[in-house]
């Protein structure tokens, strides 16, 4: 039975040209995390596998950094980075848990004036 829950940073905004940390946390389960995927709806950004370590997609190699922890740092943000990001926790014996983060990348002047969801 899957008892765990994924906590995420939820809806976040960041400045164009800046960076953001995408972070999820799996709680309420003793299941072992064996792999975490970071994905958009149409493509994979990165995988952190307990045995193989980190894999970063070539499409994001120049501006994605692994971590902190199982999170992902997205750098040199553009407005095209606006959208939904999924953290997919592969666990044993529970199975797969999915969390989501919506990122809005704002023009600098807008971000400076404290845009909020």
């Amino acid at each position: 039975m899957m008892t765990g829950t994924i906590e995420t940073t939820g809806n976040i905004s960041a400045e164009k040209g800046g960076s953001i940390i995408l972070q999820c946390h799996l709680s309420s389960t003793t299941a072992q995390v064996t792999q975490v995927n970071w994905e958009q709806q149409d493509q994979l950004l990165a995988i952190c596998n307990a045995d193989l370590g980190w894999h970063i997609s070539p499409s994001f190699k120049d501006r994605v950094a692994p971590g902190p922890g199982l999170g992902l740092t997205l750098q040199s943000l553009t407005v095209n980075d606006t959208g939904e990001y999924f953290c997919i926790y592969h666990t044993y014996p529970d199975g797969t848990y999915t969390g989501r983060i919506f990122l809005e990348v704002l023009e600098s002047s807008v971000a400076e004036h404290g845009a909020r969801f």
């Epitope: 709806q41 894999h55 997609s57």
Partner: antibody, heavy 118, light 107 residues
Framework: DVQLQESGPGLVKPSQTLSLTCTVT?????????WNWIRQPPGKGLEWMGY???????RYNPSLKSRITISRDTSKNQFSLKLSSVTAEDTATYYC???????????WGQGTLVTVSS | DIQMTQSPSSLSASVGDRVTITCRAS??????VAWYQQKPGQAPRLLIY???YRYTGVPDRFSGSGSGTDFTLTISSLQAEDVAVYYC?????????FGQGTKLEIK
């Protein structure tokens, strides 16, 4: 339980537009996931055609991009495929399927055979 | 597009045999590979995702392994009901592509 069911004409004439609908029961197509079309010509392999996500954005296989449109009718919990300018090469069993996280296909319709012939 | 190449295209084995099907991706897809079983007249059925994770309800005689470009589906002890065509699929990015299939028969 989630169920998907394809419907539409089994015979389409060359140069016309193929239109199919997938009716989803047991889950709202606006709640989550991406809703896909995958086809399989007789005796051949599988080809991913495209999807419409729960938020309404579509993504297509570049090999079909100029001919394909996937849309949805949220009031009926249906999504649809339109493929224009069909030829005999488009004869296939067409499946609708739900994409999971990660992007595997765990739920499929039973498939519907569409023959392109005059 | 990422191409997926399966081998063999067909194979015949006896009940109880250990069967291995391989799939090679044209570029590094890390562990983003799924395996399906398709029986005649039916839709494909998901067996394995993320290279080695068995989907809910799939018998434990099915296992997957591999990373990067080389992947394997193994049936540890072949059963009569495993006669089917098996497909690999990468789930790395769109367009998702499938291998050409491996037809498995019983000797």
């Amino acid at each position: 339980d989630v169920q998907l069911q394809e419907s539409g004409p089994g015979l389409v004439k060359p140069s016309q537009t193929l239109s199919l609908t997938c009716t989803v029961t047991g889950y709202s197509i606006t709640s989550d996931y991406a809703w896909n079309w995958i086809r399989q010509p007789p005796g051949k392999g599988l080809e991913w055609m495209g999807y419409i996500s729960y938020s309404g954005s579509a993504r297509y296989n570049p090999s079909l991009k100029s001919r394909i449109t996937i849309s949805r009718d949220t009031s009926k919990n249906q999504f649809s495929l339109k493929l224009s300018s069909v030829t005999a090469e488009d004869t296939a069993t067409y499946y609708c399927a739900r994409k999971g996280y990660p992007a595997y296909f765990a739920y499929w319709g039973q498939g519907t055979l569409v023959t392109v012939s005059s | 597009d990422i191409q997926m190449t399966q081998s063999p295209s067909s194979l015949s084995a006896s009940v109880g045999d250990r069967v291995t099907i391989t799939c090679r991706a044209s570029q590094d897809v890390s562990t983003a590979v799924a395996w399906y079983q398709q029986k005649p007249g039916q839709a494909p059925r998901l067996l394995i995702y993320s290279a080695s994770y068995r989907y809910t309800g799939v018998p434990d005689r099915f296992s997957g392994s591999g990373s990067g470009t080389d992947f394997t589906l193994t049936i540890s002890s072949l059963q009569a009901e495993d006669v089917a065509v098996y497909y690999c699929q990468h789930h790395y990015s769109t367009p998702y592509t499938f291998g050409q299939g491996t037809k498995l028969e019983i000797k």
